[in-house]
Interface confidence: low
Amino acid sequence: IPTEIPTSALVKETLALLSTHRTLLIANETLRIPVPVHKNHQLCTEEIFQGIGTLESQTVQGGTVERLFKNLSLIKKYIDGQKKKCGEERRRVNQFLDYLQEFLGVMNTEWIIES
Amino acid sequence: IPTEIPTSALVKETLALLSTHRTLLIANETLRIPVPVHKNHQLCTEEIFQGIGTLESQTVQGGTVERLFKNLSLIKKYIDGQKKKCGEERRRVNQFLDYLQEFLGVMNTEWIIES
């Protein structure tokens, strides 16, 4: 897959592939994978991709199922790149506070918070 | 502060405190703090709280500004707890795929993705 494919298109294609190969992927009845118990997915990217690795090692490769795992590894690459950008630029306190305020604002309105 | 305060209320109070103490916090003109360059905040919690630590060490404590940093440390505690819950429960492949699909769905609709 060319890495030039826009990430948004990559995600859409991966969702379609996941749907297509679901039956094959769930064939292993005994396999157990850690699943996060909340919906703040971005906090759990490491565990999600560890789970994908476990699944890949247990799945017969070939055809479009291989493309699914290739896509997922490109998505991981994108997320790793985003994580690198978390601490790349040093800015004034003012700008840091803007980001902190935005983060808390998003946490306040969009996170699924259990008290 | 009692940790029994619901996290949602804690976040709201922290936003108010941050607003009130902004002038005091930006007093240090020379301080530079790493600021993420994208809006997928959850990926950057580690860097955000490192920045808060830097800011705290440079801020004259006392009164409600102390409460601000106490609140922020409670929010960090909550997020750390959420991160622990990322890999706590081992489930069937079926349930993992549900979560993965949900994650990709959220990424597809809610993430700010630069190609």
Partner: nanobody, 122 residues
Framework: QVQLVESGGGSVQAGGSLRLSCAAS??????????MGWFRQSPGKEREGSLA???????AYAGSVKGRFTISVDNAKNILYLQMNNLKPEDTAMYYC??????????????WGQGTQVTVSS
């Protein structure tokens, strides 16, 4: 267009009290969904940071007014209040109310009022 209008300012002796009000014109504006605050600007000085902030029931105060000033909001009437007790000459200033999403007054103020003058004499 939403406008914030302050009232209740005036002249008072040190130790006295005043209650400032801030009303919004425009039916679409609801105080309950905004972060609301009071600011002040003394003659010849820059506008100070927020004196008091209220956001969805949570309040915060600057050290200089804590224990003397109380911020509150009447969501039904869409009015923001600032009860000022034990006033000091250094409280003399033009007082402004402001509204913003997520309390981001400095980088993204949504609405500002025109201000109401408070004068405290010794």
């Amino acid at each position: 267009q939403v406008q914030l209008v302050e009232s209740g300012g005036g002249s008072v002796q040190a130790g006295g009290s005043l209650r400032l009000s801030c009303a919004a014109s425009g039916n679409t504006f609801s105080f309950s969904t905004y972060c609301m605050g009071w600011f002040r600007q003394s003659p010849g000085k820059e506008r100070e940071g927020s004196l008091a902030t209220i956001y969805d029931g949570s309040t915060a105060y600057a050290g200089s007014v804590k224990g003397r000033f109380t911020i509150s909001v009447d969501n039904a009437k869409n009015i923001l209040y600032l009860q000022m007790n034990n006033l000091k000459p250094e409280d003399t200033a033009m007082y402004y109310c402001a509204a913003a999403k997520y309390c981001m007054f400095w980088s993204d103020p949504s609405y500002w009022g025109q201000g109401t003058q408070v004068t405290v004499s010794s």
